[in-house]
Interface confidence: medium
């Protein structure tokens, strides 16, 4: 039968099985989440997009799922990231007491997956799904990440860290999830400071990327929200990870890196 053709790739193969299996694995490795009924989680996930027009999904659609996946990160332990997911995840796998969104149940379930349904049928669309740019922004995947990213930022407290990619033309991008959602949902009553870690790409790159105009823009946005801003250059990400793994290594200087460290009030 006729099915709308979208510009984006279709739902990830074996999507229901993948979500359910990830949920079971997550609750096994995080005994603190054992009260979560994975079948109910899948039902709530499915309910957010199945039989709905995939360009008209709302944050409200995901509220039952968000309620089931309620989790809170301890203060000072939230790590946000923008355009540098792999290093952020490598970091939290070593620094086990810090958490990215993908270390939380809902982020873990959906990481790297695509999904959508279609209006008035209970089928999952494995052929194509709406592309954010070419089709619509209110698609199931984009709205999901906007919803859970908002909540993740809202519940953060203490000093929040963000890892930014220093190799990109826009180190801080206002159109990224971090720039458009998370920055604006940090709560000044709970968050004392945002500390940006700018990750350098080139091995011999000794520039102070904390002086980049886009970082100044981020500083301005954060300061206007009454949150203090700090910035660090991470010149050698490989060294950085090694020193997180083994802080006693003689070549590891005190702190995260031998970098310029800027305090902005």
């Amino acid at each position: 039968r006729w099915r709308q053709q979208w510009s984006g790739s279709g739902t990830t193969s074996r999507f229901p099985e993948t979500v359910l299996a990830r949920c079971v694995k997550y609750t096994e490795v995080h005994p603190e989440m054992r009260h979560v009924d994975c079948q109910s989680v899948w039902d709530a996930f499915k309910g957010a997009f199945i039989s709905k027009y995939p360009c008209n999904i709302t944050e409200e659609d995901y509220q039952p799922l968000v309620k089931l996946g309620t989790q809170t990160v301890p203060c000072n332990k939230t790590l946000l990231w923008s355009r540098i997911k792999d290093l952020a995840h490598q970091f939290t796998q070593v620094q086990r007491d810090m958490f990215t969104l993908e270390d939380m149940l809902l982020g873990y379930l959906a990481d790297d997956l695509t999904w959508c349904g279609e209006f008035n049928t209970f089928e999952i669309n494995y052929q194509s799904c709406p592309d954010w740019r070419k089709d619509c922004s209110n698609n199931p995947v984009s709205v999901f990440w906007k919803t859970v990213s908002r909540r993740f930022a809202e519940t953060a407290c203490g000093v929040v860290h963000v890892m930014l990619n220093g190799s990109r033309s826009k180190i801080f991008d206002k159109n990224s999830t971090f720039g458009s959602v998370e920055v604006h949902n940090l709560q000044p009553e709970k968050v004392q400071a945002l500390e940006a870690w700018v990750i350098h790409g080139g091995r011999e790159d000794s520039r102070d990327l904390c002086q980049d105009p886009t970082i100044k823009e981020l500083e301005s946005i954060i300061s206007k929200r009454n949150i203090r801003f700090f910035c660090k250059n991470i010149y050698r990400p490989d060294k950085f990870l090694q020193c997180v793994k083994n802080p006693e290594d003689s070549s590891c200087l005190s702190g995260i890196s031998a970098s310029h460290h800027h305090h902005h009030h």
Partner: antibody, heavy 120, light 111 residues
Framework: QVQLQQSGAELVRSGASVKMSCKAS????????MHWVKETPGQGLEWIGY????????NYNQKFKGKATLTADTSSSTAYMQISSLTSEDSAVYFC?????????????WGQGTLVTVSS | DIVLTQSPASLAVSLGQRATISCRAS??????????MHWYQQKPGQPPKLLIY???NLESGVPARFSGSGSRTDFTLTIDPVEADDAATYYC?????????FGGGTKLEIK
């Protein structure tokens, strides 16, 4: 600092119910599971279950289902455990305990315990 | 349920010597690179106190005389050297699977 303050000792008749409390302070009550553990000279330590005050989710040891009921009042940061149809087997010290949270699912903080004595 | 069997049930060790307590699980408590086994110390009239978490990690503030080792089904708590204050009952506990279970306890007496 994290503190768990439990209600005082109870002497109760066989067949009755008892409800004990565990008042939490020094942390966000809704962010961490509250566990309950039973201690008897014969059985040692037994895990009863836990409640997640953030959404009221519970997880019981099958052995205590129908015997223990866990609830939480977020306005007073207090967790409760009710034990029903008491018998001499329920005479024990009951502890509330909190884990370290995400990736730290072991008992880091404990209440001082509530002694329950069942009389016939 | 995963049954944890501790041995010995009690032991007496001279001051300054080594105490070794064993905990055997009825099935593996390892999962995704972690051994979900923890050790507690309990003194009369007090709640248990966490010593070792995830098989071998020393809890903050616990003296380095305490150490944990083992994987899958066999775990060991070692106290070396033993001090007078170590007289207590020691419990292992798993939370790899529900219900979370404790061992029967080992009572340590200092000679």
């Amino acid at each position: 600092q994290v503190q768990l303050q439990q209600s005082g000792a109870e002497l109760v008749r066989s067949g009755a119910s008892v409800k004990m409390s565990c008042k939490a302070s020094g942390y966000t009550f809704t962010s961490f599971n509250m566990h309950w553990v039973k201690e008897t000279p014969g059985q040692g330590l037994e895990w009863i279950g836990y409640i997640y005050p953030g959404n009221g989710g519970t997880n019981y040891n099958q052995k205590f289902k129908g015997k223990a009921t866990l609830t939480a009042d977020t306005s007073s940061s207090t967790a409760y455990m009710q034990i029903s149809s008491l018998t001499s087997e329920d005479s024990a010290v009951y502890f509330c305990a909190r884990t370290g949270g995400l990736r730290r699912a072991y008992f880091t903080y404990w209440g001082q315990g509530t002694l329950v004595t069942v009389s016939s | 349920d995963i049954v944890l069997t501790q041995s010995p049930a009690s032991l007496a060790v001279s001051l300054g010597q080594r105490a070794t307590i064993s905990c055997r699980a009825s099935e593996s408590v390892d999962s995704y690179g972690n051994g979900f086994m923890h050790w507690y110390q309990q003194k009369p009239g007090q709640p248990p106190k966490l010593l070792i978490y995830l098989a071998s990690n020393l809890e903050s503030g616990v003296p380095a005389r305490f150490s944990g080792s083992g994987s899958r089904t066999d775990f060991t708590l070692t106290i070396d050297p033993v001090e007078a204050d170590d007289a207590a009952t020691y419990y292992c506990q798993q939370n790899k699977e529900d219900p979370w279970t404790f061992g029967g306890g080992t009572k340590l007496e200092i000679k």
